[in-house]
């Protein structure tokens, strides 16, 4: 079956990084500069995408590859392949339309992107507050009482517990 | 589910230090808070000392200024520094890695014994 396609397609043989020229008799001519052909049996060759800006590049264009971009320090990647750049906040804050703000009260973000999310309830998980949350750190929970008394179902079962003076949250 | 192995623990007369090491199995970081408990025979287990993710520490108020807490996220360790040991220090003292959804994970315990 190759050998028929080839027979009757002679652009089949063109290998990755050349593309079958038409206007010289169907003949592979390698990919001109930046410029690139990542399978077999091409008639043209790609624009190598150029990383400029905001961007920068990380991997160069090669006969056979696109080239492949992310961000300058203070920004990060987002969307497939890096197709945007977004700014950076400081952990302890989320960007907005108006730039970075800090987190609201009983948020945190422990990283430079994405949004504030609220700190963990721990009643809600039958735990305590161990460690107030910050706007850069969620709270710690820790087993409570009840759930470190005798009888009580945990990892090894310990005695009960009393919490050292800390404020709850 | 990370397995804990605490070690350091031993006797010591009143007034010395010991250095409890607590050795996890996996990865802590995605621990919000390491902790330290005590149980001493006939008492209830109770909160040493807890350290969160970032290194922020909270302490019992029986040991604040005598103990420090310390995490280690690389080497995947949690420290207790135990200084000015009193007899009343005397207890098992257990290791408890803490999630903030999901059960909490515990060592066996090292022996601590401060003799007067």
């Known amino acids: 079956f190759e050998r028929t396609r080839s027979l009757q397609d002679p652009c089949s043989n063109c290998p990755a990084g050349t593309f079958c020229d038409n206007n010289r008799n169907q003949i592979c001519s390698p990919c001109p500069p930046n410029s690139f052909s990542s399978a077999g049996g091409q008639r043209t060759c790609d624009i190598c995408r150029q990383c400029k800006g905001v961007f920068r590049t990380r991997k160069e264009c090669s006969s056979t590859s696109n080239a492949e971009c992310d961000c300058t320090p203070g920004f990060h990647c987002l969307g497939a392949g890096c197709s945007m750049c977004e700014q950076d906040c400081k952990q302890g804050q989320e960007l907005t339309k108006k730039g970075c703000k800090d987190c609201c009260f009983g948020t945190f973000n422990d990283q430079k992107r994405g949004i504030c999310r609220p700190w963990t309830n721990c009643s809600l998980d039958g735990k305590s507050v161990l460690v107030n949350g910050t706007k850069e750190r969620d709270v710690v929970c820790g087993p409570s009482p009840a759930d470190l008394s005798p009888g009580a179902s945990s990892v090894t079962p310990p005695a009960p517990a009393r919490e050292p003076g800390h404020s709850p949250q | 589910e990370v397995q804990l192995v605490e070690s350091g623990g031993g006797l010591v007369q009143a007034g010395g230090s010991l250095r409890l090491s607590c050795a996890a199995s996996g990865n802590i970081f995605s621990y919000n808070g390491m902790a330290w408990y005590r149980q001493a025979p006939g008492n209830q287990r109770e909160l040493v000392a807890v350290?969160?993710?970032?290194?922020?520490?909270k302490y019992a108020d029986t040991v604040k200024g005598r103990f420090t807490i310390s995490r280690d996220n690389i080497k995947n360790t949690v420290n207790l520094e135990m200084n000015s040991l009193k007899p009343e220090d005397t207890a098992v003292y257990t290791c408890?890695?803490?999630?903030?959804?999901?059960?909490?994970?515990w060592g066996q315990g090292t022996q601590v014994t401060v003799s007067s």
């Open positions: 408890a890695a803490l999630r903030n959804s999901g059960s909490t994970s």
């Open positions: 350290v969160a993710i970032d290194g922020t520490a």
